[in-house]
C-alpha cells in the first residue's frame, strides 16, 4: 500500500480468482483513543472499533472511503483504491490502446518545435468518475523539471456503438535549449483513477522524435505566363523554431486531382517555392518536415488550382 | 525519399555539401545496423545514449546561432579553446566563435573516425561477419575533415590485445551510430546556418 495523495491510498493486488488479497491496517488520524468506530462509504454498518482497523482487501467491494467516527462526528477518512496486477502486468483498463506507432501505445505526444513544449493525449470510452494527474521530467534517476498543466477533455467522437473521449495535456520543459542534443528522454507519467480503480501510464521520448511541424502558412499560387505551370509559394509556420537557417524544414508539394484514384504528382524541395503543373479541378498541397531529422510530416496546407 | 528533389546550390560554403553527405551516410549506416542487428538492442528506445565527445568538445555551445545566445538554457557551456585556422573559412570575415565552432566539429569527426576504425577492425574479426562499417561513411567523414582542414595531432587508433566481445561491440556500434547521427544533424544545421549568414 502506498499514498497517492493525502488520505488516498493505493493497494496493489495480484489479480486472479480467489487471490488472498492484501492485509491493510488503517489508522484513524485523531488524538482520541476510545469510542472510535469505522464505516465504509455511505453504509452505516460498523466494520470495527478502535483506533486501527485491519481489513483484507481482495476485490473492489473492499475498496472505497473508510471513515472513522466518534459519537456521530467524523474524525478522518482514508480512500482505498485498487491497482490490479494481472499475471505480472499492471492493468490498462482505463485507457484505449491507440496502436500507433506500435501496440500498447496509450499516451501519444507531439511537439510543434524544439522549445521544450509538447502536448500529450490519450483516449478512453469512460465518461464519468474519471480523474487524471500528469507529471513529467527529463530523465528519471536525476530528474530535471518539466511543468505540466491539468489534463482536459479535448474531443469527443462516436466510434461505432461507443463514444470515445480524448484528453490532452500541455507540458513545458523548465529550461530547454532548442539547439541541445538530447541524451536523456522526457518521461511522462499519467495517473488515472476510475471510480476505485487506479492505473498509471508512462511514455518516454526525445523531443526530436515527436516533432510534427504545423503546416506551411500563406500558401499562394502565381500563374506563369503562357503556361499551365504555376509557382507555388509558402512560408515557414509561425510556431517553428528560429532561426530558420538553423532549424531548416524540407517540403513536399503534391498536385492531387479531384478523384482520390488520380495519380498524385509530388515534388520535394528545401526551398519555399516550387513550380508545378496545375490541372483543372486539382488542388495543390504542401507539408513540412524537419530537414535533417526525419520525424513526422506536418498536416497538409492546401489551395485549389482554380 | 526516392522522388524528385530540388536540391539547393551548396553556394559559397564548401562544407555544406560534405555535411549533407555525412548525415545521409550515417543515417543509412544506422538503418542498416538496425535491420542487420534486429535481435540486438539497437533502437533509440533500447540503447543508452552516450556522447563520446562529452567534456572533450563543445560543438553545440560553440556553434550556437546568435539568435539563441540570449537563451540562458543554451549558455551553460564549458569554455574550450581550439586551433583557429580552416579552409571552410576561406574568403570570409570570420569571428573567433566561428573558428571555434568549426574546429570543435573537426575534433568531433576525428574522435568518431578513430572509434569507428577501431570498431571496424574488431568487427572484421567476427566469425559471423554480420556487419561492417560502410566505407562510404568513413570516406565522407574524411572528406569533411579535409574540407575543414584543421591542423591537429593525429590520434592513434586504439588497439586492444584481449579477444573482442562481438555482442558488446555490436551494441557499442549502435550506441555510437545513434550519437553520431545526432551530432551529424547538429553539424548540418550549423553548416546551413553559416551558409545563410
Amino acid at each position: 500500500i502506498w499514498e497517492l495523495k493525502k488520505d488516498v491510498y493505493v493497494v496493489e493486488l495480484d489479480w486472479y480468482p480467489d487471490a488472498p488479497g492484501e492485509m491493510v491496517v488503517l489508522t484513524c488520524d485523531t488524538p482520541e483513543e476510545d469510542g472510535i468506530t469505522w464505516t465504509l462509504d455511505q453504509s452505516s454498518e460498523v466494520l470495527g472499533s478502535g483506533k486501527t482497523l485491519t481489513i483484507q482487501v481482495k476485490e473492489f467491494g473492499d475498496a472505497g472511503q473508510y471513515t472513522c467516527h466518534k459519537g456521530g462526528e467524523v474524525l478522518s477518512h482514508s480512500l482505498l483504491l485498487l491497482h490490479k496486477k494481472e499475471d505480472g502486468i499492471w492493468s490498462t483498463d482505463i485507457l484505449k490502446d491507440q496502436k500507433e506507432p506500435k501496440n500498447k501505445t496509450f499516451l501519444r505526444c507531439e511537439a510543434k518545435n524544439y522549445s521544450g513544449r509538447f502536448t500529450c493525449w490519450w483516449l478512453t470510452t469512460i465518461s464519468t468518475d474519471l480523474t487524471f494527474s500528469v507529471k513529467s521530467s527529463r530523465g528519471s534517476s536525476d530528474p530535471q523539471g518539466v511543468t505540466c498543466g491539468a489534463a482536459t477533455l479535448s474531443a469527443e467522437r462516436v466510434r461505432g456503438d461507443n463514444k470515445e473521449y480524448e484528453y490532452s495535456v500541455e507540458c513545458q520543459e523548465d529550461s530547454a535549449c532548442p539547439a541541445a542534443e538530447e541524451s536523456l528522454p522526457i518521461e511522462v507519467m499519467v495517473d488515472a483513477v476510475h471510480k476505485l480503480k487506479y492505473e498509471n501510464y508512462t511514455s518516454s521520448f526525445f523531443i526530436r522524435d515527436i516533432i510534427k511541424p504545423d503546416p506551411p502558412k500563406n500558401l499562394q499560387l502565381k500563374p506563369l505566363k503562357n503556361s499551365r505551370q504555376v509557382e507555388v509559394s509558402w512560408e515557414y509556420p509561425d510556431t517553428w523554431s528560429t532561426p530558420h537557417s538553423y532549424f531548416s524544414l524540407t517540403f513536399c508539394v503534391q498536385v492531387q486531382g479531384k478523384s482520390k484514384r488520380e495519380k498524385k504528382d509530388r515534388v520535394f524541395t528545401d526551398k519555399t517555392s516550387a513550380t508545378v503543373i496545375c490541372r483543372k479541378n486539382a488542388s495543390i498541397s504542401v507539408r513540412a518536415q524537419d530537414r535533417y531529422y526525419s520525424s513526422s510530416w506536418s498536416e497538409w496546407a492546401s489551395v485549389p488550382c482554380s | 525519399r526516392n522522388l524528385p528533389v530540388a536540391t539547393p546550390d551548396p553556394g559559397m560554403f564548401p562544407c555544406l555539401h560534405h555535411s549533407q553527405n555525412l548525415l545521409r551516410a550515417v543515417s543509412n549506416m544506422l538503418q542498416k545496423a538496425r535491420q542487420t542487428l534486429e535481435f540486438y538492442p539497437c533502437t533509440s528506445e533500447e540503447i543508452d545514449h552516450e556522447d563520446i565527445t562529452k567534456d572533450k568538445t563543445s560543438t553545440v555551445e560553440a556553434c550556437l546561432p546568435l539568435e539563441l545566445t540570449k537563451n540562458e538554457s543554451c549558455l551553460n557551456s564549458r569554455e574550450t579553446s581550439f586551433i583557429t585556422n580552416g579552409s571552410c573559412l576561406a574568403s570570409r570575415k570570420t569571428s573567433f566563435m566561428m573558428a571555434l565552432c568549426l574546429s570543435s566539429i573537426y575534433e568531433d569527426l576525428k574522435m568518431y573516425q578513430v572509434e569507428f576504425k577501431t570498431m571496424n577492425a574488431k568487427l572484421l574479426m567476427d566469425p559471423k561477419r554480420q556487419i561492417f562499417l560502410d566505407q562510404n561513411m568513413l570516406a565522407v567523414i574524411d572528406e569533411l575533415m579535409q574540407a575543414l582542414n584543421f591542423n591537429s595531432e593525429t590520434v592513434p587508433q586504439k588497439s586492444s590485445l584481449e579477444e573482442p566481445d562481438f555482442y558488446k561491440t555490436k551494441i557499442k556500434l549502435c550506441i555510437l551510430l545513434h550519437a553520431f547521427r545526432i551530432r551529424a544533424v547538429t553539424i548540418d544545421r550549423v553548416m546551413s546556418y553559416l551558409n545563410a549568414s
Epitope: D14, Y16, P17, D18, A19, E86, D93, N103, K104 | -
Partner: antibody
C-alpha cells in the same frame, strides 16, 4: 472454490461451425479476463484467444483470426468460443482458463474436425 | 506457432537434478514473466511456477524456476517417478496485449 466446467465439443465436418461453453463458479467472473487454449493430439499447448473482464477487447491467434469469436455473458458467468469454417487442423482439446498469475483451467473439451 | 523453444525431452534417475530450458526473445521472456506447467497424460495443465520463480502453494519445493535475459529454466532437484510428465513454459508477447506464448514442451522421463 474456483471451477470452470466446459461443454460443446464433438465431431464436426470441415467448414461447419461449433460453439464451446465454459461455465464459471466460485469467483466473481465479471472481474477477470479469460483465455481459450488448445492442444492438438500429441502436440503442445497453443493459445487461441483472450477476452478482457468486461468484453471490451478481444485478441486472437493468427491461426484462428476471422474464423473464431470469443465472447462472454457476465450475467450467466459463461465464456464462449464460436468456431466457424472449421478445418482439420483445428482438431484439438480446447481449454478455457482464467487470466492471472494463478490460473485455473477447465477440464478440456475435444473438438474433432473430420469428414 | 510456438515462439518459445524447449528441448523435446530430458531424463534423469530418481534423486537426480534435471533442468529444462526455455528460450525466447526480447518481446516475450525478455520483457515479461514466465510460468511453468506440468501436464500429466489426459489431464489439464497444472501450474508449477509463476512470476519466473514463484511457487503456488501445494507445489513441492523441489520445483524451482529462474529467468535470465531472454531465457528461463525449470529445475527439479531430486526428481521423482511421479514427476514424469510434459512440461511447458509460457510467457506473453509484449507487442500484443493478452497474447500468451507457449514453449514447445519437454517430456521428462524418470529412468529406472
Amino acid at each position: 472454490q474456483v471451477q470452470l466446467v466446459q461443454s460443446g465439443g464433438g465431431v464436426v465436418q470441415p467448414g461447419r461451425s461449433l460453439r464451446l461453453s465454459c461455465a464459471a463458479s466460485g469467483f466473481t467472473f465479471s472481474s477477470y479476463g479469460m483465455h481459450w487454449v488448445r492442444q492438438a493430439p500429441g502436440k503442445g499447448l497453443e493459445w487461441v484467444a483472450f477476452i478482457r473482464y468486461d468484453g471490451s477487447n478481444k485478441y486472437y491467434a493468427d491461426s484462428v483470426k476471422g474464423r473464431f469469436t470469443i465472447s462472454r455473458d457476465n450475467s450467466k458467468n459463461t465464456l464462449y468460443l464460436q468456431m466457424k469454417s472449421l478445418r482439420a487442423e483445428d482438431t484439438a482439446v480446447y481449454y478455457c482458463t482464467t487470466h492471472g498469475s494463478h490460473d485455473t483451467w477447465g477440464q478440456g473439451t475435444m473438438v474433432t474436425v473430420s469428414s | 506457432s510456438y515462439v518459445l523453444t524447449q528441448p523435446p525431452s530430458v531424463s534423469g534417475t530418481p534423486g537426480q537434478r534435471v533442468t529444462i530450458s526455455c528460450s525466447g526473445g526480447r518481446s516475450n521472456i525478455g520483457s515479461n514473466t514466465v510460468k511453468w506447467y506440468q501436464q500429466l497424460p489426459g489431464t489439464a495443465p497444472k501450474l508449477l511456477i509463476y512470476g519466473n520463480d514463484q511457487r503456488p502453494s501445494g507445489v513441492p519445493d523441489r520445483f524451482s524456476g529462474s529467468k535470465s535475459g531472454t531465457s528461463a529454466s525449470l529445475a527439479i532437484t531430486g526428481v521423482q517417478a511421479e514427476d514424469e510428465a510434459d512440461y511447458y513454459c509460457q510467457s506473453y508477447d509484449s507487442s500484443l496485449w493478452g497474447t500468451r506464448v507457449f514453449g514447445t514442451g519437454t517430456k521428462v522421463t524418470v529412468l529406472g
